[in-house]
Interface confidence: medium
């Protein structure tokens, strides 16, 4: 889970080791701050949990692409 140190900077120290289905994801944000030990993606899930993921993993990249497309194509 993400950890806020000296808010507003939020850092990830561990990544999830389980793929999360895109059907359970609501949004994401990238963590690129030099104050954090590693680059990360924080997914927000449909049940409001925030999960740290490794941006180098393919499923993470695919999930971000999927969420980007959802934003670009609003539901009628």
């Amino acid at each position: 889970q993400p950890d806020a140190i000296n808010a507003p900077v939020t850092c990830c120290y561990n990544f999830t080791n389980r793929k999360i289905s895109v059907q359970r994801l609501a949004s994401y944000r990238r963590i690129t701050s030099s104050k954090c030990p590693k680059e990360a993606v924080i997914f927000k899930t449909i049940v409001a949990k925030e999960i740290c993921a490794d941006p180098k993993q393919k499923w993470v990249q695919d999930s971000m692409d999927h969420l980007d497309k959802q934003i670009q194509t609003p539901k009628p």
Epitope: K19, I20, S21, V47, I51
Partner: antibody, heavy 119, light 108 residues
């Protein structure tokens, strides 16, 4: 260690309601969901519905829609399942089970509550 | 709703034999969100496998799961006396969640 403790056996008349409780200990209650699953005598498992306290979501199987209400009280770490308009076919063991809201496998189960519907 | 069909309904085997249980879904279970449970008489079900192939904590290595999409398998490599029970598959990608009807593994 996570433990789910359910209320005791009930005998009910047809047409009445039953409310089964499921008290959780050993985990962060609001971070998890609770599913309710029933098992009629000699039959398989049947998913009834679920609640995710963190998001306030409830989901019900269509078969039970309108007859079942699942609630949760975070202050006591207790989930409840109320089934109304009982009929003899509702005689079953009712289980609560915990799931992680992100995923969904049922990793911890209550001991079960036998509900007998008989006139 | 996703219908899960388990086969066979009953499997009669001897201790030490290999058990192969099948679970077929009526539509794809995305991201392999499928679990297997073991249930013994008078007891609550116990989680064995989640995400189709990951063993739950404390589950012996003789239990393994495989499959994706619509076809899933639970394998018990060498049956121990305590493995004779009913096994259920469960999909948790969609609401409503659904269970298979169960496979009973009995002593031959």
């Amino acid at each position: 260690q996570v433990e789910l403790v359910q209320s005791g056996a009930e005998v009910k008349k047809p047409g009445s309601s039953v409310k089964v409780s499921c008290k959780a200990s050993g985990g962060t209650f609001s971070s998890y969901g609770i599913s309710w699953v029933r098992q009629a005598p000699g039959q398989g498992l049947e998913w009834m519905g679920a609640i995710n306290p963190l998001a306030g979501h409830t989901h019900y199987a269509q078969k039970f829609q309108g007859r079942v209400t699942i609630t949760a009280d975070e202050s006591t770490s207790t989930a409840y399942m109320e089934l109304s308009s009982l009929r003899s076919e509702d005689t079953a063991v009712y289980y609560c089970a915990r799931y992680d809201g992100i995923y969904g496998e049922l990793d911890f189960w209550g001991q079960g509550t036998l509900v007998t519907v008989s006139s | 709703d996703i219908v899960l069909t388990q086969s066979p309904a009953t499997l009669s085997l001897s201790p030490g034999e290999r058990a192969t249980l099948s679970c077929r879904a009526s539509q794809s279970v995305s991201d392999a969100y499928l679990a297997w449970y073991q249930q013994k008489p008078g007891q609550a079900p116990r989680l064995l496998i989640y995400d189709a192939s990951s063993r739950a904590t404390g589950v012996p290595a003789r239990f393994s799961g495989s499959g994706s999409g619509t076809d899933f398998t639970l394998t018990i490599s060498s049956l121990e006396p305590e493995d004779f029970a009913v096994y259920y598959c469960h999909q948790y990608i969609f609401y409503p969640n659904t269970f298979g009807q169960g496979t009973k593994v009995e002593i031959k």
